[in-house]
Amino acid sequence: MASALRPPRVPKPKGVLPSHYYESFLEKKGPCDRDYKKFWAGLQGLTIYFYNSNRDFQHVEKLNLGAFEKLTDEIPWGSSRDPGTHFSLILRDQEIKFKVETLECREMWKGFILTVVELRVPTDLTLLPGHLYMMSEVLAKEEARRALETPSCFLKVSRLEAQLLLERYPECGNLLLRPSGDGADGVSVTTRQMHNGTHVVRHYKVKREGPKYVIDVEQPFSCTSLDAVVNYFVSHTKKALVPFLLDEDYEKVLGYVEADKENGENVWVAPSAPGPGPAPCTGGPKPLSPASSQDKLPPLPPLPNQEENYVTPIGDGPAVDYENQDVASSSWPVILKPKKLPKPPAKLPKPPVGPKPEPKVFNGGLGRKLPVSSAQPLFPTAGLADMTAELQKKLEKRRALEH
């Protein structure tokens, strides 16, 4: 196997962003293409950018890996053996075929793609130690990039899971970000607030438009980061909305799960006297990074009457209070550890009081309704590895406590 770590390339002029994790010539054939087309391609973050030549600054196409499903080696049509230069990238809704110049180049592309989508260095490819080292460097960069772009209240949860989370842990906040319900590149915001004595869950769409996030409200508002999106919601409600932050030591304070001997149901057991320790939630909203000039918020509206809606929901969630809901038997996912704030003294959440109120629906001036998201095949979404790995550890710890 060739030992060169990088394919030959013409260096681009300095100052061209983004600098790619990996780049080389690549021939691409999409679902609608009859033939392969040759590009200079570069991987940055979860996107492959395609350029007409390696001297171009401006990409002509890009491919988002957010709906990554798998990579497969491809034997070209009419061939009896694998020449080692073809591979396929299968996304949730399409398959793209690639052709490269060498086996090494194919393994490099596969390796870097897997590194960014699975957030781990692949171990089952034909790679040299030097290649693996490059991938471990890219892994570190990608983790750092994700940390910068993802607020702590962003969780890889679905619509109803978000609702459950906000209902069961109201003391941890009432606003979270989650992946877009329609599988697109944006995000959704789920909030839970009191209206007329009833808790109302709402979902809002945030579309990704180039480098900006556009909050889909009556007058769409543009933000340059997800932190700025959170800032918008917090500011526009006079801080009535608090980003959902679950402390990593939450379960140590709340207690642990114990199997009920009689029926096998898991029961939440609170320690009789919690000692001085971490509070269930990081108190209050995380200090948000200062908004850039593009993100300057318009003057705050007057303190909204509870009947007035400051934004247009995707659709209201059920107005159900959290009392008497089932206690979840495993810990909640936190993509990033929240930045530590000074912790208030530990306190247990108040026990449920009184009967569950009758569900009511709040439908005050909602403006235009947005369509609910589509039912699509449910495959692993990129960026889940970071969360599931952490979650698996937590689940193992919890199971150990159970036995």
């Epitope: 679905s158 459950l164 996912p333 039912a375 699509q376 449910l378 692993p380």
Partner: antibody, heavy 119, light 107 residues
Framework: EVQLLESGGGLVQPGGSLRLSCAAS????????MSWVRQAPGKGLEWVSS????????SYADSVKGRFTISRDNSKNTLYLQMNSLRAEDTAVYYC????????????WGQGTLVTVSS | DIQMTQSPSSLSASVGDRVTITCRAS??????LNWYQQKPGKAPKLLIY???SLQSGVPSRFSGSGSGTDFTLTISSLQPEDFATYYC?????????FGQGTKLEIK
């Protein structure tokens, strides 16, 4: 191809226990949810319980709360329903179903497994 | 919990007919409503999600409409394979509920 295969059904006496399994293939338990739905002979569909993968949070129909426990093993791609204190009215075909994208509908279903509670 | 009421509970029709089944929710559920088809001895099959979106692979003669509390499933021209039981389901709340079903029989 997405496939769901239930097992574990059978005849059990009132008060007894049974554990149903649902082996999933063609997708991974990473994000979203799975549910158990049952259908008593000649009757309509009744949702029983759901579990969400990211958090492991669960929800139950009032009719089974405190008696049934839903769980999953992500590493085995398997969903479970532990049924305790079974009653005659729990007799039904039990289906496992996968939630579609963002919980909009149950897009894939298993073939079902029959649970009969009778003395 | 949210109650779902379907009407009619049974319906006789002929091949080629246009058929409409309605579903009413006990409270507003936005557009979080699905329709399923079930044939005897088989698992249900998702036809329509989000009130009006056709699930992939489902023939275009099936359509859904409505939002809030009132929803409709329409089969524009009945085919022999459409004789089955149809269920509506709300996914607005995580305490999912189904309608009692509408049995569509050959006249």
């Amino acid at each position: 191809e997405v496939q769901l295969l239930e097992s574990g059904g059978g005849l059990v006496q009132p008060g007894g226990s049974l554990r149903l399994s649902c082996a999933a293939s063609g997708f991974t338990f990473y994000y979203g949810g799975m549910s158990w739905v049952r259908q008593a002979p000649g009757k309509g569909l009744e949702w029983v319980s759901s579990i969400y993968y990211s958090s492991g949070s669960t929800s139950y129909a009032d009719s089974v709360k405190g008696r049934f426990t839903i769980s999953r093993d992500n590493s085995k791609n398997t969903l479970y329903l532990q049924m305790n204190s079974l009653r005659a009215e729990d007799t039904a075909v039990y289906y496992c179903a996968r939630h579609g994208w963002d919980d909009n509908g149950f897009d894939y279903w298993g073939q079902g497994t029959l649970v009969t509670v009778s003395s | 919990d949210i109650q779902m009421t379907q009407s009619p509970s049974s319906l006789s029709a002929s091949v080629g007919d246009r058929v409409t089944i309605t579903c009413r929710a006990s409270q507003s559920i936005s557009s979080y409503l699905n329709w399923y088809q079930q044939k005897p001895g088989k698992a249900p099959k998702l036809l329509i999600y989000a009130a009006s979106s056709l699930q992939s692979g489902v023939p275009s003669r099936f359509s859904g409409s409505g939002s809030g509390t009132d929803f409709t499933l329409t089969i524009s021209s009945l085919q022999p394979e459409d004789f089955a039981t149809y269920y509506c389901q709300q996914v607005y709340s995580y305490l999912f509920t189904f309608g009692q079903g509408t049995k569509l029989e050959i006249k």
